[in-house]
């Protein structure tokens, strides 16, 4: 239950040093006074401490016109010191002056801590003009006080270029504790102390703290704040909350989850982007991390394929993004693909296999066996090889390319020509005569071109001259192509 | 080194009263609850209750309402248990521990036997 | 009340041996903790808040569960262990105690 302390007013303020009482004229000694007219400042001893000197809050007036007597001098009347209040209930103090007649113009402000109050402050100033004198009331309100209305208020009043200030009036709001820390959501290790800090403060004052566990009070005797809880240490999620009491009740902080970290759930949702013979881009939606940051992932690749070892291929890659393209994979060979993240707990269990292919690749090999020879009496170039020896990944042959290169004096030029899968043999027209014909074949498939053959030469000679033998590319392992003429 | 030193072994008459004091020292006494714990001959331990160290005020278990009162002396760190119109199944070792969080009672008095007999 | 149950309640075992009690609660509890005692002697703190060791408390004794069930462990029995343990709960008042298990010298 929350109970509400009986408003007091208290005579003292308590705030730090003393503060003087009464002023009276029999504490005051009148000082030499230039030739001026108007108020000058006093020096005045005060009498909760004798012998030291005080200023500020009276002024002395000089001799009056007709220079027979002393008006008192100028001061605030003491009222109380000290004003102690609940939370949203309304205050009004005030401070009153009597001010001689002579005197024109005063003006009244208020002020809060070293600070002149200004704008939409209810302040109100009454005079009440007597024959001599006018009793002048400064009246403060504030409704709804808060806890940011405590302060030390003074008036100051403006006689002649001079300044009277009142005694301070100390507000002192109280309420419900309230929270300058509260307890925050953590991801702890399991079986792992840490800690937890909760501070409040008043006024009233002292704040005691209670911790709050799952339901269940942690300390039955309370910690004055700002107290620091040790938890020995969760095998599981659990809810924090810290009381805060005082005089006024007590106050309940937010209450903040702790949750322990595990090892991330699989990734989910597997994809396959984009593959080529000896690649395959994949994503993956990550699981849940375990209250604990993912730090890499590790995409596990197995062959699918009878013949196989049954080996599986690991590449490791950062957890984001969340995509790896896997390279040094077979052509047109079948894989299965997983996923599995680790955060600072250890390695989430391995998402769903799926299934995912190559494509076809290039032949890695050259077409064997090349042979060119010149038919001059059709103006032609025939070329013949026996099919490479390629491997099924590389795909179904599609047909070959060939490379003619010509060359004479001060002129080259490189011509492509494709050719069907069928053929063993082609005929190019010659381009050149008095030149060098360099043939290169690559056999090609829907993966792309093979590797071209090692160059065949053969030499076109002006019309006329005709020489039947052939070039050729030699048989694996004999020396370097041989130009026959 | 925490120390909880209680007072000697009590022989006592059916009716009468007994007061069991345990002194506390090397740390700070108000800082920490203090429980007692009931273990009758031969049998195991009970929680009694305990009493906050920093505003007296005692809680007791059911079992424990009525006859039974915890009461402190700050000024020389000391607890005290007192028993009235005692019976004889109120025989028993009579524990004080120092209670911190979690209901922990990390260091124990050296018991004090309390013979209710006839 | 939480009602804590330890088993097993008598408990002859030799030195070196590796032995568990197990202290079952009537309903969830936040943690156990575990105390020994020697006969004529106070309880002394063992194990606080399921699994953590009080200070000067060999390491051959472990604590471990969530719940309702938790164990002590002791790895390898020692001459001074053989002694009463007893289990007792926090996370509900009033603080319970388990009925205490009896470990004795094979």
């Known amino acids: 239950a929350i109970t509400e302390a009986r408003e007091e007013a208290k005579p003292y303020p308590l705030f730090p040093g003393p503060l003087p009482g009464s002023l009276q004229t029999d504490h005051t000694s009148l000082l030499s006074l230039p030739h001026t007219s108007g108020y000058q400042p006093a020096l005045m001893f005060s009498p909760t401490q004798p012998g030291r000197p005080y200023t500020g809050n009276v002024a002395i007036p000089r001799v009056t016109s007709a220079g027979s007597k002393l008006l008192p001098p100028l001061a605030f009347k003491h009222t109380v010191g000290h004003i102690i209040l609940s939370e949203h209930k309304d205050v009004k103090f005030n401070c009153s002056i009597s001010v001689p007649n002579i005197y024109q113009d005063t003006t009244i402000s208020w002020w809060k801590d070293g600070k002149e109050l200004l704008g939409a402050h209810h302040a109100i100033t009454q005079f009440y003009p007597d024959d001599e004198v006018t009793a002048i009331i400064a009246s403060f309100s504030i409704t709804s006080v808060q806890r940011s209305d405590n302060g030390s208020y003074i008036c100051k009043m403006k006689i002649n270029n001079e300044e009277i200030v009142s005694d301070p009036i100390y507000i002192e709001v109280q309420g419900l504790p309230h929270f300058t820390k509260q307890p925050e959501s953590m991801n702890v290790t399991r079986n792992t102390a840490f800690n937890l800090t909760c501070q409040a403060v008043g006024p009233p004052e002292p704040v005691n703290i209670f911790w709050v566990q799952n339901s269940s009070r942690v300390n039955e005797q309370p910690e004055k704040s700002p107290s620091v809880l040790t938890v020995p240490g969760l095998t599981e999620m659990a809810v924090f909350s810290c009381e805060a009491h005082n005089d006024k009740g007590l106050t309940v902080s937010k209450g903040v989850q702790i949750n322990i970290k595990a090892i991330p759930s699989p990734p989910t949702e597997v994809s396959i982007h984009n593959s080529t013979a000896h690649s395959i881009l994949i994503s993956w939606v990550p699981g849940f991390d375990g209250y604990s940051p993912f730090r890499n992932c590790s995409v596990q690749v197995k062959e699918v394929d009878p013949l196989s070892n049954g080996s599986v291929m690991i590449f490791n890659t950062s957890a984001s993004p969340h995509m790896y393209q896997i390279k040094q994979l077979q052509a047109l060979a079948n894989y299965s693909i997983g996923v599995s993240c680790m955060n600072e707990i250890g390695w989430s269990a391995v998402s769903p296999w799926i299934l995912a292919s190559t494509t076809e690749g290039a032949p890695s090999v050259a077409p064997l066996n090349v042979t060119v020879f010149l038919n001059e009496s059709r103006d032609n170039v025939d070329i013949r090889w026996m099919k490479p020896l390629t491997k099924r990944q590389a795909g179904e042959l599609v047909g070959y390319r060939i490379s003619h290169v010509w060359q004479s004096a001060g002129i080259s030029k490189e011509l492509l020509e494709e050719v069907g899968q069928n053929n063993s043999r082609a005929q190019i027209s010659v381009q050149v005569h008095n030149a060098t014909c360099t043939v290169r074949i690559a056999a090609v498939t829907k993966g792309g071109v093979g590797p071209f053959s090692d160059p065949v030469k053969i030499f076109i000679p002006a019309h006329g001259w005709v020489d039947h033998a052939p070039s050729s590319t030699p048989a694996p392992g004999n020396a370097d192509p041989v130009l026959i003429i | 080194q925490v120390q909880l030193v209680q007072s000697g072994s009590e022989l006592k008459k059916p009716g009468a009263s007994v007061k069991v004091s345990c002194k506390a020292s090397?740390?700070?006494?108000?800082?920490?609850?203090m429980s007692w714990v009931r273990q009758a001959p031969g049998q195991g331990l009970e929680w009694m209750g305990w009493i906050n160290t920093m505003s007296g005020v005692p809680t007791y278990t059911d079992d424990f309402k009525g006859r039974f009162v915890f009461s402190l002396d700050t000024s020389v760190s000391t607890a005290y248990l007192q028993i009235s119109s005692l019976k004889a199944e109120d025989t028993a070792v009579y524990y004080c521990?120092?209670?911190?969080?979690?209901?922990?009672?990390?260091?124990w008095g050296q018991g004090t036997l309390v013979t209710v007999s006839s | 009340d939480i009602q804590l149950t330890q088993s097993p309640g008598f408990l002859s075992a030799s030195v070196g041996d590796r032995v568990t009690i197990t202290c079952r609660a009537s309903?969830?509890?936040?943690?156990m903790h575990w105390y020994q005692q020697k006969p004529g002697k106070a309880p002394k703190l063992l194990i606080y808040?399921?699994?953590n060791l009080a200070q000067g408390v060999p390491s051959r004794f472990s604590g471990s569960g969530s719940g309702t069930e938790f164990t002590l462990t002791i790895s390898s029995l020692q001459p001074e262990d053989f002694a009463t343990y007893y289990c007792q709960q926090w996370g509900s008042l009033p603080f319970t105690f388990g009925q205490g298990t009896k470990l004795e010298i094979k």
């Open positions: 309903s969830s509890v936040g943690y």
């Open positions: 521990a120092r209670y911190t969080n979690y209901g922990v009672f990390d260091y």
């Open positions: 090397s740390y700070t006494f108000t800082t920490y609850g």
């Open positions: 808040a399921t699994s």
